[in-house]
Amino acid sequence: APVPPGEDSKDVAAPHRQPLTSSERIDKQIRYILDGISALRKETCNKSNMCESSKEALAENNLNLPKMAEKDGCFQSGFNEETCLVKIITGLLEFEVYLEYLQNRFESSEEQARAVQMSTKVLIQFLQKKAKNLDAITTPDPTTNASLLTKLQAQNQWLQDMTTHLILRSFKEFLQSSLRALRQM
């Protein structure tokens, strides 16, 4: 697995460099997670032909994966820093159950899947420090998450491959939209 942000050789070689700001740390953390997703997608795409499926075909699924919408205030039209930040944190919290599902889905990238999961937890902590309105953030219900996890794990092999692919693609898109918005804050 790649080295977590802040621990790469460049950081070691430059001890007198200015410490990262909160925004820089968040930016670096998201890019680190995106690198992890990229590695996981490589394994998934090598294993199955899901990656060749059209977006329209894949949209026909009953997974309730978090997605950015106009009302969330993260796009240029209707941009709202506070609303958007709440959406980003809420969405990441909702993704956690799906990242848990990914944990036993990889053979050669098991460590990478764990790194993506743990790095996301750290990212949520970074973002919660940045948010002023923590009361607006709804935490998913653990019981609902547990039954969802059981349901996903009970699917047949083909559906599990499809689910894995969809989670990775949706999480990547969510992180990209989040970082685009965060770079405006």
């Epitope: 995106l34 990547k172 898109e173 970082l179 685009r180």
Partner: nanobody
């Protein structure tokens, strides 16, 4: 890194239009975010517009909003910047840049590949 080539620049009268293209031969260009920047003589390079890996996610500088439109055609490995209602102050060298993370943004540091630029001159 991807090799980027801009084209479509030229001399145009105020109020006129131009369509710039940013093309690459690189595979997986569809996964890159692409931004347009411009640099007028004696001025800093500034952000114009960008488009994420998801084509619906675009962002514009206030000075061009409503006049410029950024779009992408992944089948052709090309990103376009359509410029309408051009003004003399739009005169600059226009550069396209790509971000392998598919994110983009309004700062030059977010991009890892740059083109050589194409000159746009708005004058009567």
């Amino acid at each position: 890194e991807v090799q980027l080539v801009e084209s479509g620049g030229g001399l145009v009268q105020p109020g006129g239009s131009l369509k710039l293209s940013c093309t690459t031969s690189g595979r997986r260009f569809s996964e890159y975010a692409v931004g347009w920047f411009r640099q007028a003589p004696g001025k800093e390079r500034e952000f114009v517009a960008d488009i994420g890996e998801q084509a619906e996610n675009t962002w514009y500088a206030e000075s061009v909003k409503g006049r410029f439109t950024i779009s992408r055609d992944d089948a052709k490995n090309t990103v376009y910047l359509e410029m309408d209602g051009l003004k003399p102050e739009d005169t600059a060298v226009y550069y396209c840049a790509a971000d392998k993370y598919g994110v983009g943004g309004n700062a030059q540091g977010y991009y890892d590949s740059w083109g050589q630029g194409t000159q746009v001159t708005v004058s009567s």
